[in-house]
């Protein structure tokens, strides 16, 4: 999704709400654009997961390890 006139109007916007599993909303984000390596400044952002940078939004998102949820994969999924 390399449209050069696209605005990062969701710059700073994270995937999902605090109660959502970021891994799920990352899939939704993929329709809007592809991912790149997270900037180094976000290396500690995702607690139990890995960071991906949403190119269209210019913001980090987390793909949680199994059994973890939350924007930063910071919570144990009690239903896992």
């Amino acid at each position: 999704d390399g449209n050069s006139t696209r605005s990062p109007e969701t710059n700073g916007l994270l995937c999902g709400d605090p109660e959502e599993n970021c891994a799920a909303t990352t899939t939704q984000s993929k329709r809007k654009g592809h991912f790149s390596r997270c900037p180094k400044q976000y290396k500690h952002y995702c607690i139990k997961g890995r960071c991906r940078f949403v190119v269209a939004e210019q913001t980090p998102s987390c793909v949680c390890d199994e059994g973890y949820i939350g924007a930063r994969c910071e919570r144990v999924d009690l239903f896992y």
């Epitope: 710059n11 700073g12 900037p39 180094k40």
Partner: antibody, heavy 116, light 106 residues
Framework: QVQLLESGGGLVQPGGSLRLSCAAS????????ISWVRQAPGKGLEWVSY????????NYADSVKGRFTISRDNSKNTLYLQMNSLRAEDTAVYYC?????????WGQGTLVTVSS | DIQMTQSPSSLSASVGDRVTITCRAS??????LGWYQQKPGKAPKLLIY???SLQSGVPSRFSGSGSGTDFTLTISSLQPEDFATYYC????????FGQGTKVEIK
């Protein structure tokens, strides 16, 4: 339209404290990272700090680490910067800006002067 | 920390000129680079993000290019409202700005 309005600047003595506020409107504040960026008189831009959407993740420039604290109140659509142990070199216009990586909307800035 | 070096620090140009400003990072930042325009007494305005993507509402005479360590902002035909100071900013390893390039009327 997106608006960011800083307040709380003023004259303070070295070693003193000040709390800046940034009132946001025109967008869903609780979904965005927000930053503070400053500019000393006649100088360039310097990133100060950012905070993520829910206030769980913050970072600071080395020059302010341990002295400044960023926070937010999503119920009030407001960002804060608590500045302690202020130094002459902290004199600058302080801008709040939307975003953590790059900054697509900026406030008009508030001037902080640290002088005896 | 990553240092950003802009050149030139200032330049004089005329309306209609093609203007090029360069920015060099002290280490590779992929394409994590933005360009801003600032006029005296005003807040900066985002022009370009991700090295080459034009921010919404910004005239198409502005363009950005580069990746890794070397980046360029080009104004294809300078307009009266373009006289300002321009800053690059990397956002790979924290957020650091170049020292600025002042574009003045010749």
């Amino acid at each position: 339209q997106v608006q960011l309005l800083e307040s709380g600047g003023g004259l303070v003595q070295p070693g003193g404290s000040l709390r800046l506020s940034c009132a946001a409107s025109g967008f869903t504040f609780s979904r965005y990272w927000i930053s503070w960026v400053r500019q000393a008189p006649g100088k360039g831009l310097e990133w100060v700090s950012y905070i993520d959407s829910w206030g769980s993740y913050t970072n600071y420039a080395d020059s302010v680490k341990g002295r400044f604290t960023i926070s937010r109140d999503n119920s009030k659509n407001t960002l804060y910067l608590q500045m302690n142990s202020l130094r002459a070199e902290d004199t600058a216009v302080y801008y709040c800006a939307r975003g953590g990586s790059l900054f697509d909307y900026w406030g008009q800035g508030t001037l902080v002067t640290v002088s005896s | 920390d990553i240092q950003m070096t802009q050149s030139p620090s200032s330049l004089s140009a005329s309306v209609g000129d093609r203007v090029t400003i360069t920015c060099r990072a002290s280490q590779g930042i992929i394409s994590y680079l933005g360009w801003y325009q600032q006029k005296p007494g005003k807040a900066p305005k985002l022009l370009i993000y991700a090295a080459s993507s034009l921010q919404s509402g910004v005239p198409s005479r502005f363009s950005g290019s580069g990746s890794g360590t070397d980046f360029t902002l080009t104004i294809s035909s300078l307009q009266p409202e373009d006289f300002a100071t321009y800053y690059c900013q990397q956002y790979d390893d924290w957020d650091t700005f170049g020292q600025g390039t002042k574009v003045e009327i010749k």
